[in-house]
Amino acid sequence: FERTRSLQDPCSNCPAGTFCDNNRNQICSPCPPNSFSSAGGQRTCDICRQCKGVFRTRKECSSTSNAECDCTPGFHCLGAGCSMCEQDCKQGQELTKKGCKDCCFGTFNDQKRGICRPWTNCSLDGKSVLVNGTKERDVVCGPSPADLSPGASSVTPPAPAREPGHSPQ
């Protein structure tokens, strides 16, 4: 089948990094500079992506593969193949239309991207707050005295607990 196909279509013999040049009797010609073909049998080469402005070259274009971009410091990639760069914020902030804004009380963001999320409500899971939350970090929940009492189920059944002096949330 491959043999038949190549007799019918000489272009199928053109490997990646080349194109089937109709202007030159369907001879396989190398891709011109700043272009590539990642598969065989191509009739044209694709233009290489250029990483300009806020984009930075992560991988140079070759005759067989496109360039890959990432973002300059202070920005992070969004979308498939880093199609966009979005401004970083500090931990404890989120990006809004008006720029980076601090997380509201009761929310946190432990990354330079994304949105502020609410602190965990420990009591919903039957736990106690051991360490209060901040803008940059969630609260720390721990076993409540009931969880640590004899007969309560846990990974290694411990005895009852009494929490140290800390201010509950």
């Epitope: 899971d125 360490v131 901040t134 609260v139 720390v140 929940c141 721990g142 846990s154 990974v155």
Partner: nanobody, 116 residues
Framework: EVQLVESGGGLVQAGGSLRLSCAAS????????MAWYRQAPGNQRELVAV???????KYADTVKGRFTISRDNIKNTVNLEMNSLKPEDTAVYTC??????????WGQGTQVTVSS
């Protein structure tokens, strides 16, 4: 679930120091808090100290100024530095890995005895 193994316990005279270490079998970075609990014979288990992912620590009033908890998210260890030990610090000290959602993982404990 992470496995925790404590070490460093032993017999020490009042006023002495010990350093307890808790080694985790896996990544502790995903745990919101790492803590040390203790239980003396006939007493309830009590929280001694807890350290959040960013190193923020809280202590029981009974150990404040004497004990220091720290965590190393790269080496997956949690240490408890215990100074100016008192006979009332005698207990089994147990390491715990705390997740805000899900169960708490516990070590088997290490005995600390402070003689007067």
């Amino acid at each position: 679930e992470v496995q925790l193994v404590e070490s460093g316990g032993g017999l020490v005279q009042a006023g002495g120091s010990l350093r307890l270490s808790c080694a985790a079998s896996g990544n502790i970075f995903s745990y919101n808090g790492m803590a040390w609990y203790r239980q003396a014979p006939g007493n309830q288990r009590e929280l001694v100290a807890v350290v959040a992912i960013d190193g923020t620590a809280k202590y029981a009033d009974t150990v404040k100024g004497r004990f220091t908890i720290s965590r190393d998210n790269i080496k997956n260890t949690v240490n408890l530095e215990m100074n100016s030990l008192k006979p009332e610090d005698t207990a089994v000290y147990t390491c715990a890995a705390l997740r805000n959602s899900g169960s708490t993982s516990w070590g088997q404990g290490t005995q600390v005895t402070v003689s007067s």
